[in-house]
C-alpha cells in the first residue's frame, strides 16, 4: 500500500521545505484516498464485469450513499463555504460504514482497502479542525450502521460485487466534488 501523506521519505529528506498548510494537507489526503480507490476499482473490474454495468442499473439501487446536491452549497453556483464543509464532513462520516463493508471484499488489495478506510478517518479529523460549526454535523447512529453492515454482508455474491462497485464509484465522485469545493475555500 502507498505511504500515507506526511509519511513520505521525501519529506524527511527535505527538512527545509515549508510545512504543508492545512488546505494543502487536506488536498494531498484526498488525492491519496482517490489513488487508493483507483487501485481497488482495478481489482473489482478485473474480477467481474460489474464495471460494465449500465448507469441505469446502478441508479436502481437501494443503498443510501451520500451524494452532493445543489442545496449543499458545494457547487460553483450557490457556493457556501460553511454549508459545504458540513456536507463534506457529514458525507464522509456516512461513508464510513460502507468503507467498513469493503474491508473483506479484496484479495490482493486488502491493505489498500484498509489504507483507504484509515486515511478517510484522518481526513475527517483534518476537516473537523477546519469547521467552525461542528454542531451542525450529524454523526450516524452506530446501531443503524451495525444493522446496515449486517444486511450488506448478508447479500448474495452478485449483489455484494455490485455494492462494492457502486460504493467505490460513489465515494470517488463524492471525493472529487469535495476536492473541487475545498479548493475554492
Amino acid at each position: 500500500a502507498p505511504v500515507p501523506p506526511g509519511e513520505d521519505s521525501k519529506d524527511v529528506a527535505a527538512p527545509h521545505r515549508q510545512p504543508l498548510t492545512s488546505s494543502e494537507r487536506i488536498d494531498k489526503q484526498i488525492r491519496y484516498i482517490l489513488d487508493g480507490i483507483s487501485a481497488l476499482r482495478k481489482e473489482t473490474c478485473n474480477k467481474s464485469n460489474m464495471c460494465e454495468s449500465s448507469k441505469e442499473a446502478l441508479a436502481e439501487n437501494n443503498l443510501n450513499l451520500p451524494k452532493m446536491a445543489e442545496k449543499d452549497g458545494c457547487f460553483q453556483s450557490g457556493f457556501n463555504e460553511e454549508t459545504c464543509l458540513v456536507k463534506i464532513i457529514t458525507g464522509l462520516l456516512e461513508f464510513e460504514v460502507y468503507l467498513e463493508y469493503l474491508q473483506n471484499r479484496f484479495e490482493s488489495s486488502e491493505e489498500q482497502a484498509r489504507a483507504v478506510q484509515m486515511s478517510t478517518k484522518v481526513l475527517i479529523q483534518f476537516l473537523q479542525k477546519k469547521a467552525k460549526n461542528l454542531d451542525a454535523i450529524t454523526t450516524p447512529d452506530p446501531t443503524t450502521n451495525a444493522s446496515l453492515l449486517t444486511k450488506l454482508q448478508a447479500q448474495n455474491q452478485w449483489l455484494q460485487d455490485m455494492t462494492t462497485h457502486l460504493i467505490l464509484r460513489s465515494f470517488k465522485e463524492f471525493l472529487q466534488s469535495s476536492l473541487r469545493a475545498l479548493r475554492q475555500m
Epitope: N62, R105, N156, W158, M162
Partner: antibody, heavy 119, light 111 residues
Framework: EVKFEESGGGLVQPGGSMKLSCVAS????????MNWVRQSPEKGLEWVAE??????????YYAESVKGRFTISRDDSKSSVYLQMNNLRAEDTGIYYC??????????WGQGTLVTVSS | DIVLTQSPASLAVSLGQRATISCRAS??????????MNWFQQKPGQPPKLLIY???NQGSGVPARFSGSGSGTDFSLNIHPMEEDDSAMYFC?????????FGGGTKLEIK
C-alpha cells in the same frame, strides 16, 4: 452436470449427534457458497446454514434455530461440505439437502439425506 | 428476515388451462434492477427442481410453458398450458440475502 451426494443421515436419539457430508461435482467447488437446507412436513423448506468463501476468507451463517448446535465446514480439496449436528431435537427431523447458491442466485440441490430424531 | 407468503395453498386446474401461483415478499427482494426470486417444483420423494431464477429466467431444461414475472415484492409463476406432469408442489424462494427463505408451498393438481 452439477451434482451433490449427501450421506450420514439416519436415526438418532434426542440430545445425540450426527455428521452429514456432501460431495459435489460438475463445477468449480471452491468458488461457490455452500448451504444446507432441510425439509419437514411441519416446517416446510427451511434454510439451515451457509459457508461462504469471499476473498480467501470464510464467512459462516446459521439459522437462529440451529445456532450453537450445528457447525458447517468445508474441504475444498475434497469438494465437500459438512454439517456437524449436536444436541439434536425432535424438531430437527427432516430431509437435509446440500445446496449451492450460484453467483446469480441460482440454487442447485442434492437428493437429500433423511435425519430422524426420535427416542 | 424476508417472509414469503405464497397463495393459494392449493389449486386445481384443468389440462390445457392456465395455473397462476403468487408469492409476496415482506420487503423488496430486488436491487440494481434484478429481483432475486426463484421458483421450484417438487414431486413426492424428489428434491426441489429449479424452474425459474431471478424472477423470470428459465432454469436449464425447463419447458417454455413455465414462466415467471414480477418485481420488488410481488411475483407470480404461470403454467400454461397445464399438463399432466405438472401436478406437484411449487415453492418460491428469495436469494437476495441470508437467511434464504421459502414460501409455504402451493399444491397444484389436475381438475
Amino acid at each position: 452436470e452439477v451434482k451433490f451426494e449427501e450421506s450420514g443421515g439416519g436415526l438418532v436419539q434426542p440430545g445425540g449427534s450426527m455428521k452429514l457430508s456432501c460431495v459435489a461435482s460438475g463445477f468449480s467447488f471452491s468458488n461457490y457458497w455452500m448451504n444446507w437446507v432441510r425439509q419437514s412436513p411441519e416446517k416446510g423448506l427451511e434454510w439451515v446454514a451457509e459457508i461462504r468463501l469471499t476473498s480467501n476468507k470464510q464467512a459462516i451463517y446459521y439459522a437462529e434455530s440451529v445456532k450453537g448446535r450445528f457447525t458447517i465446514s468445508r474441504d475444498d480439496s475434497k469438494s465437500s461440505v459438512y454439517l456437524q449436528m449436536n444436541n439434536l431435537r425432535a424438531e430437527d427431523t427432516g430431509i437435509y439437502y446440500c445446496a449451492s447458491l450460484f453467483y446469480d442466485g441460482y440454487l442447485h440441490w442434492g437428493q437429500g439425506t433423511l435425519v430422524t430424531v426420535s427416542s | 428476515d424476508i417472509v414469503l407468503t405464497q397463495s393459494p395453498a392449493s389449486l386445481a386446474v384443468s389440462l390445457g388451462q392456465r395455473a397462476t401461483i403468487s408469492c409476496r415478499a415482506s420487503e423488496s427482494v430486488g436491487n440494481f434492477g434484478i429481483s432475486f426470486m426463484n421458483w421450484f417444483q417438487q414431486k413426492p420423494g424428489q428434491p426441489p427442481k429449479l424452474l425459474i431464477y431471478t424472477a423470470s429466467n428459465q432454469g436449464s431444461g425447463v419447458p417454455a410453458r413455465f414462466s415467471g414475472s414480477g418485481s420488488g415484492t410481488d411475483f407470480s409463476l404461470n403454467i400454461h398450458p397445464m399438463e399432466e406432469d405438472d401436478s406437484a408442489m411449487y415453492f418460491c424462494q428469495q436469494s437476495k440475502e441470508i437467511p434464504w427463505t421459502f414460501g409455504g408451498g402451493t399444491k397444484l393438481e389436475i381438475k
